[in-house]
């Protein structure tokens, strides 16, 4: 999906109002220094591409982020403010609903969410630079 036509201001507002809180809740008990940020992004669409990938694409050591509250809110936000996004995500949504309801938070998932927080912060910064 090409994130170029998204309403970035609205996405930022949703992130600051609600998604960030859920990400921080997920990370509670860990220190910001526990993980190194290895994933970066260069502009707003690129940041959203990376955020989409880390949030919804299962990895071998962290397969279950898509059903977390922050992920559901991220998907809702992208559906609202990125025209055409929903249509490209039908299969991902179905896979998310089929995902098992295990609540195991592995260290690898914590690391991935730490990367997500970094990407979101980068997204906000690139937004500020443009204004």
């Amino acid at each position: 999906y090409d994130f170029t036509n998204c309403d970035f201001q609205k996405i930022e507002a949703d992130y600051l109002r609600t998604i960030s809180k859920d990400l921080i809740t997920y990370m509670s008990g860990t220190k910001s220094t526990d993980f190194n940020n290895t994933v970066s992004c260069s502009n707003r669409p690129h940041c959203l591409t990376e955020i989409q990938s880390l949030t919804f694409n299962p990895t071998p050591r962290c397969a279950s982020l898509a059903k977390e509250m922050f992920a559901r809110k991220t998907k809702a936000t992208l559906a609202l403010w990125c025209p055409g996004y929903s249509e490209t995500q039908i299969n991902a949504t179905q896979a998310m609903k089929k995902a098992r309801k295990s609540k195991v938070t592995t260290n690898k998932c914590l690391e991935q969410v730490s990367q997500l927080l970094g990407l979101w912060r980068r997204f906000i910064r690139t937004l500020l630079k443009k204004q």
Partner: antibody
């Protein structure tokens, strides 16, 4: 079962406000969009706005900006639509309608409608 | 945002096919594959018949089909039945600030 149940008919004076409720049951209220659509007697459908409780987003049709307020109480699975500065042209049946999850602009479940009559 | 344009009436005999058109602009129908159609019987709430241009919700007969070409969407009802007599409204997404603009409605009469 899966349904939206709206509050009863209202008669209001011009210049006053009306608040219509829409109680959801049988589905996860917060995940969907709750839209409000009205239909004046013998006329077509007109979209007023939507609320997506999951992310706390409300979007209003430009025509109703500043006059309509849509809210939601997730604890009771109830959405509300308040319209202020009523005039006779606001006489209509007001419907709440569920927007599909992540496809909030398709209205797959409707309330029974609430008739609001504005008359002096 | 102007309403979409529909013919006020359409008719057909039982068993026939009828097509209802819905014309918009590049800002709505032409710009997104987010067209839906609603059926409304007198005194009842509307019912979703078609979404995403051509998809049918479960429970809607396959006699109902939707399509789009450019800025015009169409609803076709084949094998008309008496219970198909109703008002039909098209709707289109028109951007992140306008989730639905509707057509004026078409009264379908089964002769």
């Amino acid at each position: 079962q899966v349904q939206l149940v709206q509050s009863g008919a209202e008669v209001k004076k011009p210049g006053s406000s009306v608040k219509v409720s829409c109680k959801a049951s049988g589905f996860t209220f917060g995940s969907y969009g709750i839209n409000w659509v009205r239909q004046a007697p013998g006329q077509g459908l007109e979209w007023l706005g939507v609320i997506v409780p999951l992310v706390g987003v409300t979007i209003y049709a430009e025509k109703f900006q500043g006059r309509v307020t849509i809210t939601a109480d997730t604890s009771t699975s109830t959405a509300y639509m308040e319209l202020s500065s009523l005039r006779s042209e606001d006489t209509a049946v007001y419907y709440c309608a569920r927007g599909q999850e992540y496809f909030y602009w398709y209205f797959d479940l409707w309330g029974q409608g609430t008739l609001v009559t504005v008359s002096s | 945002q102007s309403a979409l344009t529909q013919p006020p009436s359409a008719s057909g005999s039982p068993g026939q096919s009828v097509t209802i058109s819905c014309t918009g602009t590049t800002s709505d129908i032409g710009g997104y594959n987010r067209v839906s159609w609603y059926q409304q019987h007198p005194g009842k709430a509307p019912k979703l018949m078609i979404y995403e241009v051509s998809k049918r919700p479960s429970g809607v007969p396959d006699r109902f089909s939707g399509s789009k070409s450019g800025n015009t969407a169409s609803l076709t009802v084949s094998g008309l039945q008496a219970e198909d007599e109703a008002d039909y409204y098209c709707s289109s997404y028109a951007g992140t600030d306008t989730f639905a603009i509707f057509g004026g409605g078409t009264k379908l009469t089964v002769l």
